[in-house]
Amino acid sequence: DTEIKVNPPQDFEIVDPGYLGYLYLQWQPPLSLDHFKECTVEYELKYRNIGSETWKTIITKNLHYKDGFDLNKGIEAKIHTLLPWQCTNGSEVQSSWAETTYWISPQGIPETKVQDMDCVYYNWQYLLCSWKPGIGVLLDTNYNLFYWYEGLDHALQCVDYIKADGQNIGCRFPYLEASDYKDFYICVNGSSENKPIRSSYFTFQLQNIVKPLPPVYLTFTRESSCEIKLKWSIPLGPIPARCFDYEIEIREDDTTLVTATVENETYTLKTTNETRQLCFVVRSKVNIYCSDDGIWSEWSDKQCWEGEDLSKKTLLR
């Protein structure tokens, strides 16, 4: 009864196609697969950024896999060959691991890389990123931003930099077609005649950094003697109504402050006949149904009612 053995995959490597963190892991079939002609071997691939506690695990019949990584750190990966149950009478047969690593040799000291990188996708339309120069870098230092997402043939450089004192401190992006709900990769590198500059890599998804416009057309409607309905409209732009959460601040007679978070463009407020003045403001944010995170809009213009008209049916301003 001969022991079944299988070799690890050959030529296991991590290839960087220049997509700022989206890497290819590829390998060749193991030697001596002839004994297993009736079996479809599978490969168990494990990979992670160095320093991460957990491995990502994939099982595939293919000879390649692609995923995104943080190029600020190194990458380690390992792979072995698995034989399916049908070929092994139920016992596990797997090869030894083939292992590989990848990292970008860092230039410059960490302090030279950009500081406080901040990116906002305004109203799900306009992406703007800003940063501060590295610590202790000279004025001759300039930073360049490159970006890539799936759908672009290659990484692109920013063409509309925001400048301060002749230095690039931000980027206004062009229209980014079909760029949400996928990883968006950025590299900010730099050059200086004085000393090498450390590159920085960032990855995010655009729908998670949206800052909407504030709601518009705030109105009051008297529903009953003790209820007033506050209404507003979604801001102009591409964000559908189903994607919004709202926060309202209501001030009654300069004293009572009510805050509430709602999912619709209305809020019903209990009032008394003694109420002489009512003001409210609203702000919006993309909700959990459309993103994992978001940024609150600015507050809307304040809408107020003053005087006797609160007993009337509709109050518009």
């Epitope: 599978e42 099982i59 698995l82 034989l83 399916p84 149950w85 049908q86 070929c87 092994t88 009478n89 139920g90 016992s91 596990e92 047969v93 797997q94």
Partner: nanobody, 115 residues
């Protein structure tokens, strides 16, 4: 006949819950590690959670704190309790026997999470 059979998939709103089951038959279930994998748009199956024959569990970072794997060696069944589901959890979910047993796949069960 050696077999793994998943059940419990379905459609759910984002934020909802589902519990998947995988019944094993035809082999000594208790000695095998078991895993839940999923396949979305890609051909590859990614490990979601696994449980060794001694009950040790590991989870992919994307599901930590939301999914729980468990096993019942009397019923020869492994479970995946999925809470706070997200649209990106939409996939076909497969259970698989793991080491020290050979690799054996179930047929899969579809999970669809809509916003």
């Amino acid at each position: 006949q050696v077999k793994l059979e998943e059940s419990g998939g379905g459609s759910v709103q984002a934020g909802g819950s589902l519990k998947l089951s995988c019944a094993a038959s035809g082999y000594n279930f208790s000695k095998c590690g078991m895993g839940w994998f999923r396949r979305a748009l890609r051909e590859e199956r990614e490990l979601v959670a696994e449980i060794s024959n001694d009950g040790t569990t590991t989870y992919d970072d994307s599901v930590k704190g939301r999914f729980t794997i468990s096993r019942d060696n009397v019923k020869n069944t492994v479970y995946l309790q999925m809470n706070n589901l997200k649209t990106e959890d939409t996939a076909v979910y497969y259970c698989a026997s793991r080491n020290p047993c050979g690799l054996l796949w179930g047929q899969g069960t579809q999970v669809t999470v809509s916003s």
